[in-house]
Interface confidence: low
């Protein structure tokens, strides 16, 4: 390609400008440029677009349907980490905040029409996790931090006065209403990055035009890490039906029994009064908000394929390198999906010794090439061992039994689960499946921790101990609906004390 020489660049300074080649002149044809922002641990990347004008198809149906020129934004290394979004036309992408450590942009142009291009600025902000942080922050529906482009719906009422973008909690102009009131309809929020979801606040709405009130009395919750594989949130074996509003104005807060790790959230109304009208806030936090909980590179691609290995593998498509959390659509499958407990393992070499404080485990899809049936597999229980040199291994122990700790795994092939433990010094981490789904062993993984210098384990924590509870951060534990009037915040604000 003629225009691509020297148009790719890595950015490591605390702030900077990223522009299409030649900006402010029109960009050249036939470009494939990669811009990568690399942040040190504890730094959040904030990316803001100032100008954006790329060629687009006038017949383009939805956002992301870009045929000619486009900008892809990746959570991590391009084509390894998850795609955050594909952008073209003149609609400026909204502000992005990434705590993964790597944010990449790939810019593609074709041989024809050229436009003015884009100019963006980024800056890195120090994020010091609080030891006693509370995972109950409003995620941004009310404040606007969740941008309009992140909110969508199955349909919208035909008069254009009840759009998904009007579904913000305490929004003063109607709310979201589908074209037809039905329990097949949903409101969807893309949180862009993997996020802990701990609670949902809902309101109905009063029509500005008619003064009639509408509200959702109950709803189901669906979550997905990729926007394609969805899981309905369950209570036990049954789909959980959340009790919602009793009038059009009061806010009702539903706390989840346990935090859900997700990117996409769907609210699916089940019953309603007069008609469906919904305003919404989501509460939670990022995985990295907890101390020493950086994603160490499986998702982002910072950990190379060569650093991921396994006891065995089924075939290339489901090799260890496919075991990246979320970013892989498949996952790792061992050679024999139904192996003996403890026989198979997936290993990550972190490159240098780190302080490791947890893993995120996810199921996998694919795997059964004999029957051509797509297996949806996950690990129900697992053990973790670790090593500093790759030779001497220790299991994380259960302090009550002094035996290797048996961690709870997944209940679904797409929804990830975090399992935290006391800090361990490790360069190598192995996960041993012990029990698994009927479809066999299938796994994707991320390792959580921080640099060895950030959090040197004390003498006590160097031993193979683990807290008895697997999630040590103070998430809401009870599942309940609370009416909370004008303002829905978690009342316990002791998470941030003045010095």
């Amino acid at each position: 390609k003629t225009g691509s020489e020297d148009c790719s660049k890595n950015f490591t300074s605390p702030n900077g400008t990223i522009e299409s080649p030649g900006f402010p002149e029109k960009y050249p044809h036939n470009l494939d440029c990669t811009f990568t922002i690399l942040a040190k641990p504890k730094m959040e990347i904030i990316l803001q677009f100032l100008i954006f004008d790329l060629e687009h198809d006038p017949l383009q149906v939805g956002e992301g349907d870009c045929k000619y020129d486009w900008l892809d934004i990746w959570d991590g290394i391009p084509h390894v980490g998850p795609l955050i979004g594909k952008y073209c036309g003149t609609k400026t992408p909204s502000e992005l905040r990434s705590s993964t450590g790597i944010l990449s942009l790939t810019f593609h142009t074709d041989m024809a029409v050229a436009k003015d291009g884009f100019s963006a600025r980024y800056y890195l902000v120090h994020q010091e996790p609080l030891e006693n942080f509370q995972c109950n922050v409003p995620l941004g529906m009310e404040s606007g931090r969740i941008a309009n482009e992140q909110i969508s719906a199955s349909s919208t009422y035909s008069d254009g006065r009840w759009t998904p973008q009007q579904s913000r909690l305490h929004g003063d102009d109607n709310g979201w209403t589908p074209n037809l009131d039905s329990n097949k309809e949903y409101l969807q929020v893309d949180l862009r990055f993997l996020t802990m979801l701990t609670a949902i606040a809902t309101q109905g709405a009063i029509s500005r035009e008619t003064q009639n009130g509408y509200y959702v009395k109950s709803y189901k919750l669906e979550v997905s890490t990729n926007g394609e594989d969805w899981m309905v949130y369950r209570h036990g074996k049954n789909h959980k039906v959340f009790q919602a509003n009793n009038d059009a104005t009061e806010v009702v807060l539903n706390k989840l029994h346990a935090p859900l790790l997700t990117r996409f959230v769907r609210i699916r109304p089940q019953t309603w009064h007069s008609g469906i009208a919904l305003r919404l806030e989501l509460f939670g936090c990022r995985v990295t908000d907890a101390p020493c909980s950086n994603m160490l590179g499986m998702l982002s691609g910072l950990i190379a394929d060569s650093q991921i290995s396994a006891s065995s593998t089924q075939e290339y498509l489901w090799s260890p390198s496919a075991a990246r959390l979320v970013s892989s659509r498949s996952g790792w499958f061992p050679r024999i999906p139904q192996a003996q407990p403890g026989e198979e393992w997936l290993q990550v070499d972190l490159g240098t010794p780190k302080t490791v404080k947890g893993v995120i485990i996810q199921g996998a899809r694919g795997g059964d090439s004999i029957t051509a049936v797509e297996a949806r597999a996950f690990v129900r229980k697992f053990k973790v061992s670790y090593s500093l040199n790759g030779k001497d291994w220790e299991y994380i122990q259960d302090p009550r039994t002094q035996q290797p700790k048996l961690f709870e795994g997944n209940m679904h092939y797409d929804t990830p689960d975090i399992r935290r433990f006391d800090p361990i010094p490790a360069q190598y981490v192995r996960v041993y499946p012990e029990r698994w789904s009927p479809a066999g062993i299938g796994m994707r993984l991320e390792v959580l921790g921080c640099d060895w210098t950030d959090s040197k384990p004390t003498v006590e924590t160097l031993g193979p101990t683990v807290k008895s509870e697997e999630t040590t951060t103070p998430y809401p534990t009870e599942e309940e609906a609370t009416e909370c009037g004008e303002n829905c915040s978690f009342e316990d604000d002791k998470d941030l004390q003045l010095p």
């Epitope: 409003p138 009310e142 303002n487 941030l496």
Partner: antibody, heavy 121, light 108 residues
Framework: EVQLVQSGAEVKKPGATVKISCKVS????????IHWVQQAPGKGLEWMGR????????KYAPKFQGRVTITADTSTDTAYMELSSLRSEDTAVYYC??????????????WGQGTLVTVSS | DIQMTQSPSSLSASVGDRVTITCTAS???????LHWYQQKPGKAPKLLIY???NLASGVPSRFSGSGSGTDFTLTISSLQPEDFATYYC?????????FGGGTKVEIK
């Protein structure tokens, strides 16, 4: 201990420019936003603007936009507020203030002692 | 801009009295972004309460805050001599941040 120490009182003629300093200690100025607040005699508090020192990015209240410039010098851990085209109604005490770390756009936990600017012909 | 209206603008009270100051926002403010300051003559304001109801470090427990949406309250349960001052509410929910006009608490 966090401290913000401001420069001394100033007397200026209408049309002139005043530049007030705010030296911080006890923390790294780059980690904070530095805000400036005006208080006219016998009146309430009015936010003028702020600087994100690390990014050298400023935001100003519409009322002061065009007349106020906030800057910072990281080598001396000092922030500055310059107000130009002074008029008599600018006679006030000016405070620098900063939120607690980690709450950049929240409450002002620390304040300077204030600088009285008198505009008189 | 969000206007913050305090009432009363001044009040006279005696030591031991219970004092309530209200602050009304022109549009809804999340309780995480509503704060109170105390200012004594010739001094800089001092943070009293943050996030509607959390006492700043060193603030006596006779001070308390409450409210949500557009209506917020600062209460002094038993007024002490050192509490005679001017009190300001402050929102930083929407930019620009704004302050109430102040409530001067004087000795009766």
């Amino acid at each position: 201990e966090v401290q913000l120490v401001q420069s001394g009182a100033e007397v200026k003629k209408p049309g002139a420019t005043v530049k007030i300093s705010c030296k911080v200690s006890g923390f790294n100025i780059k980690d904070y936003y530095i805000h400036w607040v005006q208080q006219a005699p016998g009146k309430g508090l009015e936010w003028m603007g702020r600087i994100d020192v690390e990014d050298d990015e400023t935001k100003y209240a519409p009322k002061f936009q065009g007349r106020v410039t906030i800057t910072a010098d990281t080598s001396t851990d000092t922030a500055y507020m310059e107000l130009s085209s002074l008029r008599s109604e600018d006679t006030a005490v000016y405070y620098c203030a900063t939120p607690i770390y980690g709450s950049r756009e929240a409450w002002f936990a620390y304040w300077g002692q204030g600088t009285l600017v008198t505009v008189s012909s | 801009d969000i206007q913050m209206t305090q009432s009363p603008s001044s009040l006279s009270a005696s030591v031991g009295d219970r004092v309530t100051i209200t602050c009304t926002a022109s549009s809804s403010v999340s309780s995480s972004y509503l704060h109170w300051y105390q200012q004594k003559p010739g001094k800089a304001p001092k943070l009293l309460i943050y996030r509607t109801s959390n006492l700043a470090s060193g603030v006596p427990s006779r001070f308390s805050g409450s409210g949500s949406g557009t209506d917020f309250t600062l209460t002094i349960s038993s007024l002490q001599p050192e509490d005679f001052a001017t009190y300001y509410c402050h929102q930083y929910y929407r930019s620009p941040p704004t302050f109430g006009g102040g409530t001067k608490v004087e000795i009766k």
